[in-house]
């Protein structure tokens, strides 16, 4: 396979269903903490979408840590049988659009938007900066694209396409893309490669948003950011399909992915935990 072929492969919904987290902490990286114990624990890996083993140091860390594989699965995975390919005339909203707005338990309040299923509109609320749920968007536009209905009863998706209510076909919306590229994937795909703080030299891939390709880099083994993938294919799956791209000799838009990419980004603003 050439690099170009690989980067233009369309990964279908059946191969990569939308990631819908049951709890925000399931998106946290495995964190062994600063202590030196060797304790077998489990965490949910958002890239492999599975619960995996890791070694916990015995103190601190985060909530993405479970005593058993079963507990991890119970908290962070959904039954694959629930992932039904949608063939109905009107695309359904993601489940999280129907969740109540959730400020979370922290107090670093920032403006976010949620879909109000009563008013059928995206509205502003104050998010505390941690936890909460996925009905939580950084912009009004993002919320509208994912959760609100379009004017003619179609669901506008997050990739500039709409489901045509007449013939059930996906119609590119050229008006949504003012520049050559517009990114609609996970926001971490736009971050630079980050080696992290340790001394290992692990082969990893990051998405280079400037050139629009996945590139190798050396990861130190700890720290860094979410733009960090164990394989090129995983990198492409997560980031490449987030681009809407104009075809060079025409006005149409080619959409790399014809479904919504669910947000799993966690806010890293300064936060203040409430006294429990």
């Amino acid at each position: 396979d050439s690099e170009e072929d690989e980067e233009h492969t369309i990964i279908t919904d059946t191969e990569l269903p939308p990631l819908k987290l049951m709890h925000s902490f399931c998106a946290f990286k495995a964190d062994d903490g600063p202590c030196k114990a060797i304790m077998k624990r489990f965490f949910f890996n958002i890239f492999t979408r599975q619960c995996e083993e890791f070694i916990y140091g015995g103190c601190e860390g985060n909530q993405n840590r479970f005593e058993s594989l079963e507990e991890c699965k119970k908290m962070c995975t959904r039954d694959n049988a629930n992932r039904i390919i949608k063939t109905t005339l009107q695309q359904e909203k993601p489940d999280f659009c129907f969740l109540e707005e959730d400020p979370g338990i922290c107090r670093g309040y920032i403006t976010r938007y949620f879909y109000n299923n009563q008013t059928k509109q995206c509205e502003r609320f104050k998010y505390g900066g941690c936890l909460g749920n996925m009905n939580n968007f950084e912009t009004l536009e993002e919320c509208k694209n994912i959760c609100e209905d379009g004017p003619n009863g179609f669901q506008v998706d997050n990739y500039g396409t709409q489901l045509n209510a007449v013939n059930n076909s996906l119609t590119p919306q050229s008006t949504k893309v003012p520049s050559l590229f517009e990114f609609h994937g996970p926001s971490w795909c736009l971050t630079p490669a980050d080696r992290g703080l340790c001394r290992a030299n692990e082969n990893r891939f990051y998405y280079n948003s400037v050139i629009g390709k996945c590139r190798p880099f050396k990861y130190s083994g700890c720290g860094g950011n979410e733009n960090n993938f164990t394989s090129k294919q995983e990198c492409l799956r997560a980031c490449k399909k987030g681009f809407i791209q104009r075809i060079s000799k025409g006005g149409l838009i080619k959409t790399k992915r014809k479904r919504k990419k669910q947000r799993v980004k966690i806010a890293y603003e300064e936060i203040f935990v409430k006294n429990m």
Epitope: T119, F125, L140
Partner: antibody, heavy 118, light 112 residues
């Protein structure tokens, strides 16, 4: 017409408790986050707290956090403020106010007076 | 918390004359979404507060157009082009950009 009517105010001793109610009408109550705001005699306005549309989550001012609890019953179109460990400085007219889609208070009730005194 | 400071605290005006109230915030009220959540309330004597203006300059329905709001960042102004008898009361600015919501001390408008 949007209407918010508070009740339950009265005289209470320091350390005592009181429960205020706000009856809403003229709009779909469950669609809106709701607030309590208070106004001490001859003073300005102070935000007390907010409850989300479904009632699962609340925000509180530091001055009342841990003592006051906001709840709602969407089936009854009612908002509540449970006030415990009351202090003299909690003496005020308490207003309920609706939150609009911009997370801003748009409609206010007529208020109910709470007096904390021995 | 964001401190809201109104001036003057008392404003005696002549009927038919203009009036202006200033409101300053201790930090910018421009939110990360590009909007400025500065609002004005009117509280007539013996009544509950009523929203006049939201998002700096948007008039609530039923509010006469003699009221105008302006400003940006930390400095805001409420103007009444021609004061009428029904405008008597206390006017509060308040901000909804930062949590918790905070209010100005109020400006009492009275007829000379």
């Amino acid at each position: 017409e949007v209407q918010l009517v508070e009740s339950g105010g009265g005289l209470v001793k320091p350390g005592g408790s009181l429960r205020l109610s706000c009856a809403a009408s003229g709009f779909t109550f469950s669609s809106y986050a709701m607030n309590w705001v208070r106004q001490a005699p001859g003073k300005g306005l102070e935000w007390v707290g907010t409850i989300t549309t479904g009632g699962s989550y609340t925000y509180y001012a530091d001055s009342v956090d841990g003592r006051f609890t906001i709840s709602r019953d969407n089936a009854k179109n009612s908002l509540y403020l449970q006030m415990n460990s009351l202090r003299a400085e909690d003496t005020a007219v308490y207003y309920c106010a609706r939150q609009d889609g911009n997370f801003l208070m748009d409609y206010w009730g007529q208020g109910t007076l709470v007096t904390v005194s021995s | 918390d964001v401190v809201m400071t109104q001036t003057p605290l008392s404003l005696p005006v002549t009927l038919g004359q203009p009036a202006s109230i200033s409101c300053k915030s201790s930090q910018s009220l421009l939110d990360i979404d590009g909007k400025t959540y500065l609002n004005w309330l009117q509280q007539r004597p013996g009544q509950s507060p009523k929203r006049l203006i939201y998002l700096v300059s948007k008039l609530d329905s039923g509010v006469p157009d003699r009221f105008t709001g302006s400003g940006s960042g930390t400095d805001f102004t409420l103007k009444i082009s021609r004061v009428e008898a029904e405008d008597v009361g206390v006017y509060y600015c308040w901000q909804g950009t930062h949590f918790p919501f905070t209010f100005g001390q109020g400006t009492k408008v009275e007829i000379k």
